[in-house]
């Protein structure tokens, strides 16, 4: 079964087939009789129910809402409702770059070490049965590969392999031809045992809080085993009894690096905790990276643009 669309914020390129699959699919099959509804809201329109009659581009199948294709005006919030289960997505449809075979904002970056195994496989499991052919392009030039159903590159990486690789799937639906593009920006780097550690998420975070309440500031980094992650705040760490640095938690990634997390817990927030920098730093022999958190009173939120607030 195709995995469900669990990401709440999704960006897609106009003109391509696209689908949303809710995450209660197995449940939906068990309750066939239950009413299942899809809704959209955008701007002035609040919760408009979607059905194939609302647009010839929309199709509903079991757990899936399909767009044939998705267009700029499909941007908005989508909801799936079934009994007391609701799932919401925010969809952002962006313009296609008409001067390139791919759109820069929809590129997945991958770093490959020279001489290490390098693989690109063009697959699209959801649309698999509808795909007529698939082509693989490097820097928008078509590569001549044997398999035109699932073109694949498997080799040991060379510096010359660096570039933009685009998998383009061509498919038919209701007599129309569509294509779906997935692009990878492949960077080939020197053989290295250590990575440059990096903090995950935005570098500056304004956190809306209420006085007297508690807040947890989450800091996470991708780092090497010997690297450290720590919090810095105030003139003298440890002077505020309401601030607690929780124990570091580490998870190994398949690449042999570590996702490290450290939470700073601030209890009974007071005026003195507002509008000051709480810095989380990751340090290694190769340098440091820092991200900052600023606590802002909820009442003052209006003064700051919405996009700078953390979730």
């Amino acid at each position: 079964a195709e995995s469900c669309t669990s990401r709440p914020h999704i960006t897609v390129v106009e003109g391509e087939p696209f689908y949303l699959k809710h995450c209660s699919c197995s449940l939906a099959h068990e309750i066939e009789t239950t009413t299942k509804s899809w809704y959209k809201s955008s701007g002035s329109q609040e919760h408009v129910e979607l059905n194939p009659r609302s647009s010839s581009r929309i199709a509903l199948h079991d757990c899936v809402l399909e767009f044939w294709p998705v267009e700029l005006n499909d941007t908005g919030s989508y909801f799936f409702q079934m009994k007391n289960y609701t799932q919401k997505w925010k969809l952002n449809v962006i313009r296609r770059n008409k001067h390139s075979c791919f759109t820069e904002r929809q590129v997945t970056s991958k770093i490959v070490e020279v001489k290490k195994f390098f693989q690109i496989t063009c697959e699209n499991s959801y649309y698999q049965t509808l795909v007529n052919s698939t082509s693989l392009y490097k820097n928008c030039k078509k590569l001549l590969l044997e398999n035109n159903k699932n073109p694949t590159i498997k080799k040991n990486a060379e510096f010359e392999d660096q570039g933009y690789y685009s998998c383009v799937h061509f498919l038919h639906h209701n007599g129309k031809l569509f294509n779906i593009t997935k692009t990878f920006n492949i960077t080939i780097v020197e053989d290295r045992s250590n990575i440059v550690p990096v903090l995950l998420g935005p570098k500056l975070n304004h956190v809306a809080v209420e006085l007297g309440k508690n807040v947890r500031l989450n800091c996470s980094a991708l780092l090497n085993e010997e690297d450290v992650i720590y919090w810095m705040f105030g003139e003298e760490n440890g002077s505020d009894p309401n601030i607690h640095e929780e124990k570091e938690m580490r998870i190994m990634t398949p690449e042999g690096k570590w996702h490290a997390s450290k939470v700073l817990r601030i209890e009974n927030i007071g005026e003195s905790n507002l509008n000051v920098l709480y810095n989380c730093t990751v340090a290694s022999t190769g340098g440091t990276d820092t991200k900052s958190f600023i606590l802002v009173r909820k009442a003052d939120m209006a003064d700051i643009p919405g996009h700078v607030f953390t979730r």
């Epitope: 669990s6 990401r7 995950l200 998420g201 947890r216 989450n218 800091c219 996470s220 085993e225 929780e246 938690m249 998870i251 190994m252 990634t253 398949p254 690449e255 042999g256 996702h259 997390s261 939470v263």
Partner: antibody
Framework: QVQLQESGPGLVQTSQTLSLTCAIS??????????WNWIRQSPSRGLEWLGR?????????HYAVSLKGRLTINPDTSKNQFSLQLNSVNPEDTAIYYC?????????WGQGAMVTVSS | EIVLTQSPATLSLSPGERATLSCRAS??????LAWYRQRPGQAPRLLIY???NRATGIPARFSGSGSGTDFTLTISSLEPEDFAVYYC?????????FGGGTKVEIK
């Protein structure tokens, strides 16, 4: 205290999909302080780590190489749970399936769900 | 992947006796080794993490030592509930793996 509870069918036919859900209480699936794993146990293979999901500014999924392509783990933030879907099952997938929190190692385990794959 | 070899496979002891269980890794796992106890019909329970740290609520009779490839779990004085199967598990290399277990039985 943190508790995990597995649920799903105890019997699955060969070549079908095995679906299990793990309900979390006392913690959040999107916490920065843990990861959420599936581990199974059978007499022939012992304890076997299957995969995990966790949130660190975005969602991450890791899978055992032996099951990659067959296994999907999904978080569900609205219900504070996570699920396992194992496609194309065969009798060797018969096992007790545990959902497990990973904090200080695998520190909280569900009671386990016995799943039998019948041909 | 890392292979963890536990020895002995079975340990026959009496209540009050000292138990020493061994776990050997095929490559270094640094100090990222944990120990679990599993009683019949129950899920495994974490005893020791990162080679020597006792998990929350675990009594002082359990102690862990070692680093690199050789690790030991010691139970200073066996209680009736300690007769069970013990597993070691590493997270110092990808992917996480478990040992085959040591059964501690009543003599």
């Amino acid at each position: 205290q943190v508790q995990l509870q597995e649920s799903g069918p105890g019997l699955v036919q060969t070549s079908q999909t095995l679906s299990l859900t793990c309900a979390i209480s006392g913690d959040s699936v999107s916490t920065y302080s843990a990861a959420w794993n599936w581990i199974r146990q059978s007499p022939s293979r012992g304890l076997e780590w299957l995969g995990r999901t966790y949130y660190r500014s975005e969602w991450y999924n890791h899978y055992a190489v032996s099951l990659k392509g067959r296994l999907t783990i999904n978080p569900d933030t609205s219900k504070n749970q996570f699920s396992l879907q194992l496609n194309s099952v065969n009798p060797e997938d018969t096992a007790i399936y545990y959902c497990v929190r990973e904090g200080d190692a695998f520190d909280i385990w569900g009671q386990g769900a016995m799943v039998t794959v019948s041909s | 992947e890392i292979v963890l070899t536990q020895s002995p496979a079975t340990l026959s002891l009496s209540p009050g006796e000292r138990a020493t269980l061994s776990c050997r890794a095929s490559q270094s796992v640094s100090s990222y080794l944990a120990w679990y106890r599993q009683r019949p019909g129950q899920a495994p329970r974490l005893l020791i993490y990162d080679a020597s740290n006792r998990a929350t609520g675990i009594p002082a009779r359990f102690s862990g030592s070692g680093s690199g490839t050789d690790f030991t779990l010691t139970i200073s004085s066996l209680e009736p509930e300690d007769f069970a199967v013990y597993y070691c598990q590493q997270r110092g290399n990808w992917p996480p793996t478990f040992g085959g277990g040591t059964k501690v039985e009543i003599k």
